[in-house]
């Protein structure tokens, strides 16, 4: 279980020409609230279809009156945040629709009137518990900035809210396969789904409680691996009591990805790798323009502005895929040398080497820096017969006793802010830009208005995401 | 807190069936496995099966498949276990179990006493 | 089905000794064994699972080892509370099976 939140920041006139008129008058006096609607996965859907994930209706904003001659200012906003309560898994992709609603507030017989003013809608990936993430949208000549994340409710934790913090059992440690649950380190993450004790590696489970096992094992908790001598095929879900393998189809039998996806099997199930403009589990998703983001983790979507012109995504560093969508583990080709552990930070590989050898990638033997200490974190590097440090990030100085301040080379571009911060550095980054150092233009998507719908709350069908 | 409450003792005669019930409460039924364990007069503790609530899913010990039945009714939070075919080393009290957060029996219930005579 | 052996069957010790009861599993089990404390008249209480992973609210001074086929349970410093029969369970295979129970009595 968790909330996803959603900020407004502003809603105004877009950039260029043709702003448009204010939506109050001195004659008609209103007032501005906002609604979402969340939708899990990356559907196609309708903007009328139900709400899945949840739906919310900001409180209403200030009386505004415009003032006579005036351009359309940025219009005043509700207080507080948009909160949508999800009560099982986030499911990690997700579509968005926020609208923008009109109260008048003149003499209407019947009460105050609504209209819609603007409807902007999208596609997103979101880990639970990761930072607030910023997004501007145009519709029309309007446009809205807002702010977005997903987090977890005690004692739901992770990137899904699927496990569970409990008082750990020992004092010392926690169960087997279990992780402390940062910042509670008292506490441990327990599986929430599955059955407890099923094989984190060769159990997984599509009901909560079960333990199914992948091919090859069996057992109550697949820790059992299966003899296939006396089996008729090597396929297909094992048998919890004779551990015998059970003939079955393969998950890509028949080629379940569409638009001429190609299909490849996972151990739990398939995956499609899909060609440019389309996407989704099976490349059914089709007729995608940039004003569509359909680029992930901060990809710069180019060119793709009509249906039948294709879209780029330029990924920023960590990602790949045709839509930015998969995480690229660099650290599967062993950059670092000598027993290095290597650390891959999104924008950046580190290699974290072992005593006695330092580089970018530990290739250099630090013998003469045996008897050497470098403080706080810093390595000692062999140069010239001389040893020096290289100090870890915040430190400077022959020894890395002295701090450094991470920000003086001014790192964060397009007028982003720098701070200080125990891991290094973090931008804050200006209004249209993003990425760990603001590099990225953050392209606007440009969605048209819809057709109006009136306000309130559908509660959608009841859903599991589990 | 979690708690398993079984129904009373019973008595029946060779041949007959009983039906054990155990009724769930302060957790979500449908989402751990119930064990049924028993134990005779004076012995160790045998495992006879298990089932999940929310799918229904059996296992049961080949020892007792043939006569051994476990349902659910997750509208009342209850599992029951129904022997068939009574014989007098069928005497035992009849424990369910539930599986855990944790890998084991973690709450148990305060059993019931099946006596098999003629 | 794997077979579980405990011993000794019974074990006399006084209040504050040390003891330790083990269990010998006929095949591989991994670490997937539970220890379950039963009194007179009552329900088993689980104590251990995971071989060594003390369930909550079971006091520290018990503590389980053993990986494979060799598992033990040691009680620390014995309190009169805890003259009790003591059961291994196996749940690595179906069927789960326990040992024959260590009855726990007082010198």
């Known amino acids: 279980a968790g909330v996803f939140e959603l900020q407004i920041h502003s809603f105004g006139p877009g950039p260029g020409p043709g702003a448009p008129r204010s939506p109050c008058s001195a004659r008609l006096p209103c007032r501005l609230f906002f609604r979402v609607c969340l939708k899990p996965g990356l559907s196609e859907e309708a903007a009328e279809s139900p709400c899945a994930l949840g739906a919310a209706l900001s409180a209403r904003g200030p009386v505004y009156t415009e003032q006579p001659g005036a351009p359309a200012p940025d219009l005043p906003l509700p207080d507080g945040l948009l909160q949508v309560p999800f009560r099982d898994a986030w499911p990690g992709t997700f579509s968005f629709i926020i609208e923008t609603w009109r109260e008048e507030l003149g003499d209407q017989i019947g009460g105050p009137a609504w209209s819609l003013l603007a409807r902007v809608a999208g596609r997103r990936r979101l880990a639970a518990g990761g930072p607030w993430a910023r997004d501007i949208q145009r519709a029309g000549a309007w446009e809205l900035r807002f702010s977005y994340r997903a987090r977890c409710e005690p004692p739901a934790v992770g990137t899904a809210c699927t496990r569970l913090c409990r008082p750990r059992s020992a004092p010392s440690r926690c169960g087997p396969g279990l992780r402390p649950c940062a910042p509670l380190e008292d506490e441990c993450e327990a599986p929430l789904v599955c059955r407890a004790g099923c094989s984190p590696e060769h159990g997984f489970c599509e009901q909560p409680g079960e333990c199914r096992c992948l091919e090859g094992w069996t057992g109550p908790l697949c820790t059992v691996p299966v003899s296939t001598s006396s089996c008729l095929s090597p396929r297909g879900p094992s048998s919890a009591t004779t551990g015998c393998l059970v003939p079955g189809p393969g998950p890509c039998d028949g080629n379940p990805c569409a638009n001429g996806g190609s299909c490849s099997e996972t151990p739990r199930s398939f995956e499609c790798t899909c060609p440019r403009g389309f996407y989704g589990l099976r490349c059914e998703v089709s007729g995608v323009t940039c004003a569509d983001g359909p680029c992930f983790n901060g990809g710069l979507c180019v060119g793709g502005a009509d249906p039948d012109s294709a879209y780029i995504c330029h990924c920023p560093p960590g990602f790949q895929g045709s839509n930015c969508e998969k995480r690229v583990d660099r650290c599967s080709l062993q950059p670092c040398r000598n027993g290095g552990l290597c650390l891959d930070l999104g924008h950046a590989l580190r290699c974290r080497c072992r005593a006695g050898f330092a580089g970018p990638r530990c290739e250099h033997d630090l013998d003469d820096c045996a008897g050497r200490a470098c403080a706080n974190g810093g390595t000692c590097v062999e140069g010239g017969g001389a040893h020096r440090c290289s100090c870890a990030l915040g430190f400077g100085g022959r020894d890395c006793r002295e701090r450094a301040d991470p920000c003086a080379a001014r790192p964060c571009a397009h007028g982003g802010r720098c701070y200080a911060h125990f891991s290094g550095l973090v931008c804050a980054c200006a209004p249209g830009y993003m990425g760990a150092r603001c590099e990225f233009p953050v392209h606007p998507d440009g969605a048209s208005a819809l057709p109006a719908a009136p306000p309130g709350l559908r509660p959608g069908d009841p859903q599991r995401y589990l | 807190q979690v708690q398993l409450v079984q129904s009373g003792a019973e008595v029946k005669k060779p041949g007959a069936s009983v039906k054990v019930s155990c009724k769930a409460s302060?957790?979500?039924?449908?989402?751990?496995?119930i064990e049924w364990v028993r134990q005779a007069p004076g012995q160790g503790l045998e495992w006879m099966g298990e089932?999940?609530?929310?799918?229904?899913?059996?296992v049961y010990n080949e020892k007792f498949k043939d006569r051994v039945t476990m349902t659910v009714d997750t509208s009342t939070s209850t599992a029951y276990m129904e022997l068939r075919s009574l014989r007098s080393d069928d005497t035992a009290v009849y424990y369910c179990?539930?599986?855990?957060?944790?890998?084991?029996?973690?709450?148990w219930g305060q059993g019931t006493l099946v006596t098999v005579s003629s | 089905d794997i077979q579980m052996t405990q011993s000794p069957s019974t074990l006399s010790a006084s209040v504050g000794d040390r003891v330790t009861i083990t269990c010998k599993a006929s095949q591989n089990v991994g670490t997937n064994v539970a220890w379950y404390q039963q009194k007179p008249g009552k329900a088993p209480k689980a104590l251990i699972y995971?071989?060594?992973y003390r369930y909550s609210g079971v006091p520290s001074r018990f503590s389980g080892s053993g990986s494979g086929t060799e598992f033990t349970l040691t009680i620390s410093s014995l309190q009169p509370d805890d003259f009790a029969t003591y059961y291994c369970q196996q749940y690595n295979s179906y069927p789960f099976t326990f040992g024959q129970g260590t009855k726990l009595e007082i010198k």
């Open positions: 089932i999940l609530p929310g799918n229904g899913n059996t």
């Open positions: 302060d957790y979500t039924f449908s989402n751990y496995y």
């Open positions: 995971s071989a060594s």
């Open positions: 179990a539930r599986w855990g957060d944790y890998a084991l029996f973690a709450n």
